[in-house]
Amino acid sequence: TRDIREPPALKYGIVLDAGSSHTSMFIYKWPADKENDTGIVGQHSSCDVPGGGISSYADNPSGAGQSLVGCLEQALRDVPKERHAGTPLYLGATAGMRLLNLTNPEASTSVLTAVTHTLTQYPFDFRGARILSGQEEGVFGWVTANYLLENFIKYGWVGRWFRPRKGTLGAMDLGGASTQITFETTSPAEDRASEVQLRLYGQHYRVYTHSFLCYGRDQVLQRLLASALQTHSFHPCWPRGFSTHVLLGDVYQSPCTVAQRPQTFNSSARVSLSGSSDPHLCRDLVSGLFSFSSCPFSRCSFNGVFQPPVAGNFIAFSAFFYTVNFLRTSMGLPVATLQQLEAAAVNVCNQTWAQLQARVPGQQAHLADYCAGAMFVQQLLSRGYGFDERAFGGVIFQKKAADTAVGWALGYMLNLTNLIPADPPGLRKGTDFS
């Protein structure tokens, strides 16, 4: 008779990604006996919290905590009961809360307090709710992508750990309120704030990262809307035949639209705005989001921000993926080159509302925003970050790797639970045959 060996015990970790537009819960799992291996932590399950992001509860902080209950109840079912007490639970808030913290620090604190109160009611090992810096958001996204793709170290067939020759992948994240670019670089940073030194599995990494607040998709759309209200009686990025009533208070309440805010305006006034399907005017409107007039360093991306030349391959996830996937899949347009990406954006911006609805059935009003989104992504990559055709060829648009969502959440948990050691594993991987 043969002994049947039981599968190794699993450990679990939970991260709540409190984004600007919504909150997602990710539950990760890994074999308890392989904690220091790479690529061993994977996504067990996930849950989207209904409603808006926690920053939208500024006037009702307790509602922020209450909104998480449904997903936390799912976590109670998804994580085995005997593992509850040993499962770390984290909440990280990003640019939506960074913006709220800028404009109303008291409300920001109240929201985090309310969320903390809810999370402590559950039997998990709650380890805090906090606002991540833009730098952390960028770096942890980069760690997630490279961990999942096993770019740090790999376990070879001869039973040895080795560092893959392929190098690391840059990471580009487009959220609702901010966007991040992070990549390994050989040149020292001219701006210390944009450089992060990491030691992972005994290897040293010099990483460039920058987060642009107000350059997330939702805030960009609000800024474009504010510009359209200011300079046109129509919205060039919206399709002809589409019109809606815009509440001025909604447009101008964001700190991101402060530059376009009139000195006096009626916040409860509703203005009717129609689309004009004008790709050239839309491009001009999007161009106005980027400033290239001054650069205090040897080179900059935009708005006077230092950036070394983009190097190596990149993974572009979150709204980068959703935007490009829409062009590729829903619209059936090629997007393999920058030229094709630009042509695809122009194509979408040329569509009337009737044509767009026929191409993409069953859709809500956000369908009208894909033109602006596509124009923004194209300009951000080409003019903003300086991708040329050759560099763009090394960009993959993907939302998952190894069946796990790419984003900052996994990297954050790996860091806080020390699942990536600074020093390399032993030369030979220990195998217990007892």
Partner: antibody, heavy 120, light 109 residues
Framework: QVQLVQSGAEVKKPGSSVKVSCKAS????????VSWVRQAPGQGLEWMGR????????RYAQKFQGRVTITADESTSTAYMELSSLRSEDTAVYYC?????????????WDQGTLVTVSS | SYELTQPLSVSVALGQTARITCSGD??????VYWYQQKPGQAPVLVIY???NRPSGIPERFSGSNSGNTATLTISRAQAGDEADYYC???????????FGGGTKLTVLG
């Protein structure tokens, strides 16, 4: 009142192809789209693909990609669905359904369907 | 890939209220459509855009959609409501219509 009228039942051999037609009587395809949905015996509904005749735009479900071709003849207000490399699992009732802008291009008018039997 | 999950069957007493659910990740952010199919017949649209009824569909049929669940509600159920009900939504990421597996509604009594 627009009605859809499909071609008659078909019996096909494995490996062969079938082409089903769907004619809009009492109307045209102007501003409409047509989807093809199939239903195997005792099973649920399965979307195969769609065409927007006035835009010449088609999309197919990944499962049928390369095996299904949807076309339309605007002059006769007829849509066609051709499925190749037939296998026994393709035995089903094939429906054409009109997608209407009034219902956000969901399926507001269906025909009674065409039974396709694949058997050796 | 995006999936919609429905209960295989739901029973309701004659004249009572039947509720058929359709669950999917963040389905509340999408529009949901409901189809009724009687044996040997083609499906019929009974609810569009979450909660709207096409002309000719009785007021007894209503829909709701939020979070991860959409619901078709049939009040004062009648024998003629016995049928299979399918929810559907458009999956933007894969550019395809997705149907739920269908729910067989049985009206008792």
């Amino acid at each position: 009142q627009v009605q859809l009228v499909q071609s008659g039942a078909e019996v096909k051999k494995p490996g062969s192809s079938v082409k089903v037609s769907c004619k809009a009587s009492g109307g045209t395809f102007d501003s409409y789209a047509v989807s093809w949905v199939r239903q195997a015996p005792g099973q649920g509904l399965e979307w195969m693909g769609r065409i927007v005749p006035w835009l010449g735009f088609t999309r197919y479900a990944q499962k049928f990609q390369g095996r299904v071709t949807i076309t339309a003849d605007e002059s006769t207000s007829t849509a066609y669905m051709e499925l190749s490399s037939l296998r026994s699992e393709d035995t089903a009732v094939y429906y054409c359904a009109r997608e209407s802008p009034g219902y956000r291009y969901s399926f507001d008018v269906w025909d009674q369907g065409t039974l396709v039997t694949v058997s050796s | 890939s995006y999936e919609l999950t429905q209960p295989l069957s739901v029973s309701v007493a004659l004249g009572q209220t039947a509720r058929i659910t359709c669950s999917g990740d963040a389905i509340g952010e999408k529009y949901v459509y409901w189809y009724q199919q009687k044996p040997g017949q083609a499906p019929v649209l009974v609810i569009y855009d979450d909660n709207n009824r096409p002309s000719g569909i009785p007021e007894r049929f209503s829909g709701s959609n939020s979070g991860n669940t959409a619901t078709l509600t049939i009040s004062r159920a009648q024998a003629g409501d016995e049928a299979d009900y399918y929810c559907a939504s458009y999956d933007l990421q894969q550019a395809r219509w997705v149907f739920g597996g269908g729910t067989k509604l049985t009206v008792l009594g």
